[in-house]
């Protein structure tokens, strides 16, 4: 079966939302004039070839913008990037495209997104507002890795 991406809105536990600024995703407090991006997520169709019990492997895109989140090394460190990519092209590939995949884990209302290409690295936002989304190995310290997802229909 061919799936369709699920539109969601994402905010962190400090009620900051994701906005696109100069092709970079940043987390800012939700205000009247802030227009958060809508995230599209779709499960990898090759789930049986990925690690069990780590979460649901998903691709994350920016709804209607042909941009997807991916992880790539910059020097020694994995970094979070936005790449021009159709999320359905990733979904339909004959193998999991690991650099674009994240294990989505849910605990109660909280979600985390762990890089499939770089296990142990999670999407995070700095505890200070107005900062770009990053990848971190350090959970629950200076960075927030727990997010809330709201399904949009």
């Amino acid at each position: 079966k061919s799936e369709m991406p699920q539109p969601v809105s994402i905010q962190d536990i400090n009620h900051r939302v994701w906005v696109l600024q100069d092709q970079i995703l940043i987390a800012v407090p939700r205000k009247d004039r802030v227009s958060p991006v809508t995230i599209s997520l779709i499960s990898c169709r090759h789930v049986e070839t990925l690690e069990k019990d780590r979460g649901n492997p998903i691709y994350l895109g920016l709804n209607g913008l042909n941009l997807c989140l991916m992880c790539a090394k910059a020097g020694d460190q994995p970094t979070l990037q936005l790449k021009e990519k159709d999320i359905m092209d990733l979904y339909n590939q004959p193998e999991p495209v690991k650099s674009f995949l994240f294990y989505h884990s849910q605990s109660g209302r909280n979600s985390t997104f762990e890089s499939v290409a770089f296990p142990g690295w999670f999407i995070a936002v700095s505890s200070e507002g107005g900062c770009p989304l990053i990848l971190t190995q350090e959970l629950g310290k200076a960075n927030t890795t727990d997010f809330g997802l709201t399904m949009l229909f």
Epitope: T49, L50, Q93, P94, V97, A117
Partner: antibody, heavy 121, light 109 residues
Framework: QVQLVQSGAEVKKPGASVKVSCKAS????????IYWVRQAPGQGLEWIGR????????RYDPKFQGKATLTTDTSTNTAYLELSSLRSEDTAVYYC??????????????WGQGTLVTVSS | QAVVTQEPSLTVSPGGTVTLTCRSS?????????ANWVQQKPGQAFTGLIG???DRAPGVPARFSGSLLGGKAALTISGAQPEDEADYFC?????????FGGGTKLTVL
């Protein structure tokens, strides 16, 4: 530079097993997929299967399920193909290849030199 | 299981254009088959040419192009060079497994 170097030719008796190695250099096998393909004398290519060295998951062509076993040793950056219950029809050159995503698609970008396995009584 | 068929042999003149095709026994080849093309020159290792039907692998000369043509996957060599004399194999994806064709022996004469 990127290279896949395979083990040498093997001669085996029917019913025996063989293990072919494919040592990678110039890249980490955990960052890609390793495919195995064979070519019988005067024939086309046949896909055997593939392994994801990062987590060890495999896919096999139905024909090779139970016949072939794919493994890796990430500490030595080496992939292995083991074939069991060999028959004369398994006489072929066996190739490993890197199947990598670059930009917008997956490609077979690097191949081993091939290992001839001869099954003869 | 699907059978993938290629022309056993083709000949092209130097500088000429030739199209190799890849037919599926299950019907028309589509982009969902993610056609791959690989080349094997005599006495040399294989080289990947095309992935995803029409995406050239890094470093592959622009004279090689992939497409869909009349329900088949196609590899076109425009301005063939003597060094293009080789065996060419296509591979098509069917759900979670890959099937190779029998190969085309291309002579540049």
């Amino acid at each position: 530079q990127v290279q896949l170097v395979q083990s040498g030719a093997e001669v085996k008796k029917p019913g025996a097993s063989v293990k072919v190695s494919c040592k990678a250099s110039g890249f980490n096998i955990k960052d890609t997929y390793i495919y195995w393909v064979r070519q019988a004398p005067g024939q086309g290519l046949e896909w055997i299967g593939r392994i994801d060295p990062a987590i060890g998951t495999t896919r096999y062509d139905p024909k090779f399920q139970g016949k072939a076993t794919l493994t890796t040793d990430t500490s030595t950056n080496t992939a292995y193909l083991e074939l069991s219950s060999l028959r004369s029809e398994d006489t072929a050159v066996y190739y490993c290849a890197r199947y990598d995503y670059s930009g917008s698609s997956f490609y077979f970008d690097y191949w081993g030199q091939g290992t001839l396995v001869t099954v003869s009584s | 299981q699907a059978v993938v068929t290629q022309e056993p042999s083709l000949t092209v003149s130097p500088g000429g254009t030739v199209t190799l095709t890849c037919r599926s026994s299950t019907g028309a080849v589509t982009t969902s088959n993610y056609a791959n093309w690989v080349q094997q020159k005599p006495g040399q290792a294989f080289t990947g040419l095309i992935g995803g039907t029409n995406d050239r692998a890094p470093g592959v000369p622009a004279r090689f192009s992939g497409s869909l043509l009349g329900g088949k996957a196609a590899l076109t060599i425009s301005g063939a060079q003597p060094e293009d004399e080789a065996d060419y194999f296509c591979a098509l994806w069917y759900s979670n497994h890959l099937v190779f064709g029998g190969g085309t022996k291309l002579t540049v004469l």
